[in-house]
Interface confidence: low
């Protein structure tokens, strides 16, 4: 498993919510849904009402990082996507409010958001070589690449 690479000297300060109520679809056109209280999974849906709606909050790095750093929250909840380790499912962590400052071990709440055309990638700040990914018969997890699917389409205006 990939070792945690917490950048304890880097501080991330919350700026603002930059996207509300969007859906994430993977390259197989599967939408992210709630599997249970703790975990997410992906499924092909006929009705997108069942898909998880996310909000995206932007953070600014104290080391002037060119990457866009974000937090992912399930809309209208206090549940935040939290990275664990490689091939481990991401967790939904409940917090009373969006963190104003994140540093050290709390960077497992943050992801670098990269876009390539219509493809969106979310790399873990705590594990810079691992992506949010979907995997057949598994939860949404952290993975380095195939066979897991690491690219997503963002569907907006899904309120």
């Amino acid at each position: 498993s990939a070792p945690f690479s917490f950048l304890s000297n880097v501080k991330y300060n919350f700026m603002r919510i930059i996207k509300y109520e969007f859906i994430l679809n993977d390259a197989l056109n599967q939408s992210i849904i709630r599997a249970n209280d703790q975990y997410l999974t992906a499924a092909a849906l006929h009705n997108l009402d069942e898909a998880v709606k996310f909000d995206m909050g932007a953070y600014k790095s104290s080391k002037d990082d060119a990457k866009i750093t974000v937090i992912l929250r399930i809309s209208k909840t206090q549940l935040y996507v939290t990275a664990q380790d490689e091939d481990q499912p991401v967790l939904l962590k409940e917090m009373p409010e969006i963190p104003k400052t994140i540093t050290g071990s709390e960077t497992n709440l943050l992801f670098f958001w990269e876009t390539h055309g219509t493809k969106n990638y979310f790399t873990s700040v705590a594990h810079p070589n691992l992506f949010i990914a979907t995997k057949q018969d598994y939860w949404v997890c952290l993975a380095g690449g195939p066979p897991s699917i690491t690219d997503f389409q963002i569907l907006e205006n899904q309120a």
Epitope: N36, D37, Y39, P89, Y138, W139
Partner: nanobody, 116 residues
Amino acid sequence: EVQLLESGGGLVQPGGSLRLSCAASGFTFVRYDMAWVRQAPGKGLEWVSSIYKSGALTSYADSVKGRFTISRDNSKNTLYLQMNSLRAEDTAVYYCAKGWASFDYWGQGTLVTVSS
């Protein structure tokens, strides 16, 4: 009507093994995560293990990790718990439950007694 029927409990010596089964009916078994929880005499409920709907992922309490194995046969609508290297502290009523971490249905339980 959802029904969960546990079986396989009994008296076993320390270090012994048992296999618990849970026959599920009244819901689409393959669509749901399942779990085992237990209640020792005079104590509260303790989560033991959970398994994802496809069986692709499992999770265990630290107290049973390496000794217990959860599995399921979706073609038979049955959940299993293989218990090896049993200890006195494993003595409890074992319940099959529908769900991963929060449960909407439970079985009646099967008693496991570990004693010499």
